[in-house]
């Protein structure tokens, strides 16, 4: 279902004067450089803001900060600095809220030059804030136990672990020489720790420790470790591997009682390995090539993370900025959008429907001309911008956006040729998961999804002050606009409730002056645009992954197939706060297209079939499991992970244990003699980039 | 500490052209509204231009306007004033200074203009 | 233009005696936004001048409070409830509400 084109776009009739009677202004008595906002709870229309002020003298910084609060969905706001004792919050650790509605909230205190630090903490929705004394000063934001909003771990500027059970009013010290601290599942705690040295120059001499029992006792789980991550079940560690300066990955589904050697391949010194996204079926795995090329491979693994078949050559993941495109559509179901560099150093895009199996281009939307870079003026595809070409300092105000209760819609900056331009993108959308695309709006843009897709809403990306903002209420095809102010403001950001739920957009920034510029804050409500509720005659069914209606086996990916409820374009009305995706889902008989290449094989480009890899032709295929060397007979195949097909093709695979000993335990990694080969191509390393571009974990 | 140190100010003839710059320091500079504003040998003040916390308005008194020009450039923490067909009248010493919630919050130390043959 | 007539020109005063300075604009200082933008500036011998009390009333900071200011309209006034030997020096009102923005003339306050 693409998007419907040549409809004539007639205005929503009275709009302006409804949503002027739904647009409230705050302006904020404040001169601050900065303003954080943060959501507190779900539903709850609380909104912190805190604005910080900070100004160099000499060889300190003096800083103040307000804080205030909303709970009207940011309509009005309310000074409540004097909670926070007019303190000066660190606004690099942010708004610290718990986990799912505990209405909990951490704001650390800049107490410079002290020992200890400060912080305040409120349980309920920040109406209070009571302050504690920390007896270490933090490294980084506190974090929560997921599953216990009252336990607190912190990282100190010395490198210890403290953890709190009482939601910070007492501390204790858990270990010294920390590098790096994780929550894992059930309330376990790993970290890295260095015995005998630092954190900075000791990389790949670290323990991996847990602890079950919040510190009364702990584990060495794993030694001779760079870097560890956690994504979905698994565990990772990229562990030194004995010869010389080469990390392998190991990986763990039970919490570090037993490893097994991923099949990836070593990583030297200058490379590194990121988990691009993770669940608890599988994982996309990033393995830089060696030298400073600005990309790798990404491998996908099996439902246990140590096999791995090739998903993506000459993946686009630079090294200096750590910068990545690599995006989960989480509007549709298997679907990621990436950027590759091409050999001619072009960037191109490409997308996956199907988990990581089959890459292709963007298809070229039906409304744009190919640009200056197509060769071919027919023939060209559509290119997304995101984390690389933002850090690049491109036009690009925003990565592309999709939500998974706005079933099917990708809204991105993007170009039409045979690569990325550096010409000013245009906005492009994407109704049925990124199948097809057309130009929804000209120049770059600032764009927000609100009542589950019901209403989409645009401002302008430009360094003059704006006071214009633009909605649709049919997915992008029609666009009215509302001057929701006469004096312009420069804009610094549009605000809405994290999941797409609201109704309300609150557009952020400040005032030009010839006094002072001040904060203001205009909370537009579009509930009087949708005035009715949806209904049944609203929705209409759509079929997802659909590209050939005539085939039965239309729409299957991962083994199924799933029929959605989806609003019709033309209806003009609220899903509402409590809307639900309704999906039917229905099984499909098996094709090879729901197996991934086995171990030793892989898929030559537009065919299903998986060959042998040449270096491993006539070689017996074997691999370190649970310490066993395994043999393994296979025709080429293995299950997608999730993939829940019955019937239909089913090729042989079969595991022998071949009855002798090996290891990939990491804590004598040097007595490793598998005989396994890596999979084809790339290598890699690991950082913490997570909060920046949702990348699970990079060494 | 808010700082603003003034330069530029020189002996020109009457009909020629100057260009002053005041560097601001201890605040940050692109949330506030500037002015010039002149004192003249006999004391008086006078103001001479204003500009936006962005730089995107400007205001002049009819005795300057289109021959004084007001920019600033936020990156560098800079305010300008280019003058023009400068008169006799124009000598003084020229104050930068900066708003807040009011007018001519802070000044600085001034650079002197004289305009003569 | 506004005119910010002040008076006295000068005022003669002993240390620890109380001053007063009156400031009348020829048309109202009161804004569309209701504020009024008359400020009170000092410039002492040798120096540039110095922002004491902005809004009418509201006093800089730093600022002593036996400065205060009042005043509404067109009439303002600034009072010193005991005169220091770092308040000489000359004394400037100005608005900011109409433009172009106008300064008295100064009023010189010095020692008998």
């Known amino acids: 279902r693409s998007t419907e084109q040549g409809e004539s776009c007639s205005g929503l009739l009275g709009a302006d004067a409804k949503l002027a009677g739904n647009t409230h202004q705050h302006i904020f008595n404040d001169l601050s450089g900065s303003v954080s906002l943060a959501w507190v709870g779900d539903g709850t229309g609380v909104i912190l803001a805190l604005t910080t002020f900070q100004v160099p003298i000499f060889m300190i910084t003096i800083g103040q900060s307000k804080l205030y609060r909303s709970e009207d969905y940011g309509k009005s706001f309310e000074d409540v600095t004097n909670l926070i004792n007019n303190t000066f919050i660190r606004s690099d650790f942010g708004i610290a809220i718990g986990p799912e509605n505990s209405g909990k909230v951490i704001l650390t205190a800049d107490v410079s030059g002290s020992h200890g630090s400060r912080i305040f903490v409120s349980s309920d929705f920040g109406k209070s804030f009571t302050h504690q004394e920390l007896p270490f000063v933090p490294l980084m934001q506190i974090t929560y136990n997921p599953e216990n909003s009252n336990v607190l771990l912190a990282l100190s500027n010395k490198n210890e672990l403290w953890l709190s059970e009482d939601f910070g009013t007492n501390w204790k010290k858990l270990y010294d020489t920390v590098c790096l601290a994780k929550w894992g599942r059930k309330g376990t705690i790993f970290f890295t720790a260095n015995h005998n040295g630092s954190c900075s120059n000791d990389r790949g001499m670290l323990e991996l420790e847990r602890t079950t029992d919040y510190g009364k006792s702990f584990k060495t789980v794993a030694s001779k470790i760079y870097s560890f991550g956690l994504g979905g079940k698994f565990l990772f560690a990229s562990v030194m591997t004995g010869k010389g300066t080469l990390r392998a990955i190991h990986v763990s589904v039970d919490d570090g009682d037993t490893w097994n050697m991923a099949q990836l391949p070593s990583v030297g010194q200058e490379q590194f390995y990121s988990i691009l996204a993770a669940n608890d079926d599988m994982v996309f795995m990033h393995v830089d090539e060696p030298g400073d090329t600005g990309f790798g491979t990404i491998f996908t693994s099996d439902d246990r993370g140590i096999v791995y078949s090739k998903s993506l050559d000459r993946h686009l993941y630079t090294t200096t900025g750590g910068e990545t495109d690599f995006t989960n559509v989480t509007s549709l179901r298997g679907v990621y959008i990436t950027s590759v560099l091409s050999e001619d150093n072009s960037i191109q895009t490409m997308i996956t429907f199907d988990q990581g199996g089959r890459w292709t281009h963007l298809r070229k939307p039906e409304n744009s001309e190919c640009d200056a870079t197509a060769k071919n003026k027919n023939e060209c595809s559509l290119h997304i911008h995101a984390s690389y070409s933002i850090s690049q300092k491109l036009n690009v105000p925003m990565a592309p956006l999709s939500e998974p209760n706005a079933v099917g819609i990708v809204i991105a900056h993007g170009s039409v040729g045979d690569a990325i331009s550096v010409m000013v993108p245009d906005v492009y959308i994407s109704d049925d998961g990124g199948y097809s695309w057309t130009k929804m709006l000209e120049g770059p843009h600032y764009y927000t999804i609100l009542d589950s897709g019901g209403i989409i809403v645009a401002i302008e990306h430009s360094s003059r002050p704006i006071n214009v903002i633009k909605f649709s209420t049919d997915e992008g095809q029609c666009w009215q606009t509302y001057t929701f102010t006469r004096d312009p403001i420069y804009f610094t950001g549009l605000a809405s409730e994290p999941g797409a739920r609201s109704m309300n957009i609150s557009i952020w920034g400040f005032t030009e002056s010839f006094l002072t510029s001040q904060w203001v804050s205009y909370t537009i409500d579009f509930k009087d645009i949708l005035e009715r509720n949806c209904e049944e005659k609203d929705y209409t069914i759509w079929l997802a992954h659909s590209t050939d209606p005539e085939d039965y086996e239309d729409g299957c990916i991962l083994g199924y197939k799933e029929q959605f409820l989806r609003l019709r374009k033309s209806s003009v009305c609220q899903n509402g706060r409590d809307y639900v995706v309704t999906k039917q889902p229905s099984i499909c008989l098996c094709s090879l297209e729901d197996f991934l290449c086995d171990f030793g094989y892989y898929r030559p480009e537009n065919d299903s079939k998986c060959v042998e890899q040449p270096e491993l032709k006539g070689h017996d295929l074997e691999f370190c499991l649970y310490g066993r060397e395994e043999h393994l007979t296979t025709n080429g195949y293995r299950k997608i992970p999730g993939d829940k097909c019955q019937g239909g093709v089913n090729p042989v695979r079969e595991v022998k244990d071949l009855k002798k000993k090996c290891t990939s335990n990491f804590l004598s990694p040097e007595k490793q003699n598998s005989k396994s080969n890596g999979s084809a191509g790339g290598s890699g390393g690991l950082n913490d980039i997570f909060e920046a571009q949702k990348i699970e974990w990079h060494e | 500490e808010v700082h603003l140190v003034e330069s530029g100010g020189d002996l020109v003839n009457p009909g020629g052209s100057l260009k002053l710059s005041c560097e601001a320091s201890?605040?940050?500079?692109?949330?506030?509204?500037m002015s010039w504003v002149r004192q003249t040998p006999d004391k008086r003040l006078e103001w001479v231009a204003m500009?936006?916390?962005?730089?995107?308005?400007?205001q002049y008194p009819d005795s300057v306007k289109g021959r004084f020009t007001i920019s600033r450039d936020n990156a560098k923490n800079t305010l300008y004033l280019q003058m023009s067909g400068l008169k006799s009248e124009d000598t003084g010493t020229y104050h930068c200074?900066?708003?807040?919630?009011?007018?001519?919050?802070?000044w600085g130390q001034g650079t002197l203009v004289t305009v003569s043959a | 233009d506004v005119v910010m007539t002040q008076t006295p020109l000068t005022l003669s005063v002993t240390i620890g005696q109380p001053a007063s300075i009156s400031c009348k604009s020829s048309?109202?200082?009161?804004?569309?936004?209701?504020?009024?933008?008359l400020n009170w500036l000092l410039q002492r011998p040798g120096q540039s001048p110095k922002r004491l009390i902005y809004?009418?009333?509201k006093l800089d900071s730093g600022v002593p409070d036996r400065f205060t200011g009042s005043g509404s309209g067109t009439d303002f006034t600034l009072r010193i409830s005991r005169v220091e030997a770092e308040d000489l020096g000359v004394y400037y009102c100005?608005?900011?509400?109409?433009?172009?923005?106008?300064f008295g003339a100064g009023t010189k306050l010095e020692l008998k």
């Open positions: 200074t900066r708003h807040d919630d009011s007018w001519f919050a802070y």
């Open positions: 201890g605040f940050i500079f692109s949330i506030y509204g």
């Open positions: 500009i936006s916390s962005g730089g995107i308005y400007t």
């Open positions: 048309q109202s200082l009161l804004d569309s936004n209701g504020k009024t933008y």
């Open positions: 809004l009418v009333s």
């Open positions: 100005c608005q900011g509400t109409h433009f172009p923005l106008t």
